[in-house]
């Protein structure tokens, strides 16, 4: 029961986290510029990973996509890549984890397979969360260093004049959404990995020779009580006491990777 709850909760937390990562990636408010007043009107600038927007105090808003792929800073491209990788890994992780859920039965899928799938999805969620956190942090670092706004300078452009206006950009809402979402995905992934340990069949089967007692047709198997993980229901914890002697091959056993020979 505890395993199912941990796995289910991990799935839900990761689902929320990945939804948040997608939302953050699509949001326009990665960096914002505080309202500054002009004789005309107050203008509010904000940018995302894909486009730049301006909003006026009158309510008018205009957004434009970034014009070129090659002209964009390498850091921005890196952030885009990290966020997309995070989304892709998260989406695959969600798909895998759906089939790994203990509460969902698909054919005759063994617990060991579900455990492996749970671990795989957990690792994917962890990497996805780390990608999102890294992407958001790189962007935040870009804003903090403010490399393009060190000085206000004026220079002659193509026939006219260009002046860089001293301005500061601050953290937008998308950064906080991204950090939280990345953290949730990471937590969800850790929960899935923890759940995997409970799902893994850690039963210890001692394969033994049958001892024949004189006058009695009883096969005594040492290790007749199977060691259990303690997670979930274990209906196999019964003393094996058969009426007749059997060879080892006749007794059905379930070997696992933890068997001791």
């Amino acid at each position: 029961m505890a395993v199912t709850a941990c796995q289910g909760l991990g799935f839900v937390v990761s689902l929320i986290g990945i939804a948040g990562i997608i939302a953050a990636t699509c949001m326009d408010q990665w960096s914002t510029q505080d309202l500054y007043n002009n004789p005309v009107t107050a203008v509010f600038n904000y940018q995302g990973l894909w486009r730049s927007c301006v909003r006026e105090s009158s309510g008018f808003t205009e957004c434009r996509g970034y014009f070129t792929l090659l002209g964009l800073p390498a850091m921005l491209q890196a952030v885009r890549a990290l966020m997309i990788v995070g989304i892709v890994l998260g989406a695959i992780g969600l798909l895998v984890s759906i089939f790994a859920l203990k509460c969902i039965r698909i054919g005759s899928m063994e617990d060991s397979a579900k455990a492996n799938m749970t671990l795989t999805s957990g690792i994917m969620f962890i990497v996805s969360g780390l990608c999102a956190i890294a992407g958001v942090s790189v962007f935040a670092n870009m804003l903090v260093t403010n490399f393009w706004m060190s000085t206000a300078n004026m220079y002659t452009g193509m026939g006219g004049m260009v002046q860089t206006v001293q301005t500061r950009y601050t953290f937008g809402a998308a950064l906080f959404v991204g950090w939280v979402a990345g953290g949730l995905t990471l937590i969800g992934g850790v929960m899935m990995c923890i759940a995997c340990r409970g799902l893994a069949p850690e039963e210890t089967n001692y394969k033994a020779v049958s001892y024949h007692a004189s006058g009695h047709s009883v096969a005594y198997k040492p290790g007749g009580f199977k060691a259990s993980t303690g997670f979930g229901s274990n209906t196999k914890n019964k003393k094996i006491y058969d009426g007749g002697a059997r060879t080892e091959d006749e007794v059905q056993s379930y070997p696992s990777k933890h068997d001791y020979v």
Epitope: Q33, T41, N45, S52, V54, F60, F67, W148, V165, Y169
Partner: nanobody
């Protein structure tokens, strides 16, 4: 790179009219303001009028009524309709764009090369 191309200047009689236009081209992102400044011989450059993408306008005090600023957002073009021109309006008129490049290069003010307007009495 952003280029501003001005047109419409010239010689006009006092009381006449002119229409200036300025088109911006290149890698333009968020335009905050478009407008016109002017510089008369031996004087400082002064604001004539500005307009936002949303259509909010601002004029230098005594010019409102005679001058009308307008913009075409689809063409990234700003116009200045000048009516009842006076000899004191003689100046080089510079179009102006404030463009926000955000994380790609901050906030920048662009001025065109200027177009001469001469009002004869």
């Amino acid at each position: 790179e952003v280029q501003l191309v001005e047109s419409g200047g010239g010689l006009v009689q006092a009381g006449g009219s002119l229409r200036l236009s300025c088109a911006a081209s290149g890698n333009i992102l968020s335009i905050n303001y478009m407008g016109w400044y002017r510089q008369a011989p031996g004087k400082e450059r002064e604001l004539v009028a500005t307009i936002t993408r949303g259509g909010s306008t601002n004029y230098q005090g005594n010019l409102k009524g005679r001058f009308i600023i307008s913009g075409d957002n689809t063409k990234d073009t700003v116009y200045l309709q000048m009516n009842n021109l006076q000899p004191e309006d003689t100046a080089v008129y510079y179009c102006y764009f404030r463009i926000n490049f955000g994380i790609l290069g901050g906030l920048r003010d662009y001025w065109g090369p200027g177009t001469q307007v001469t009002v004869s009495s």
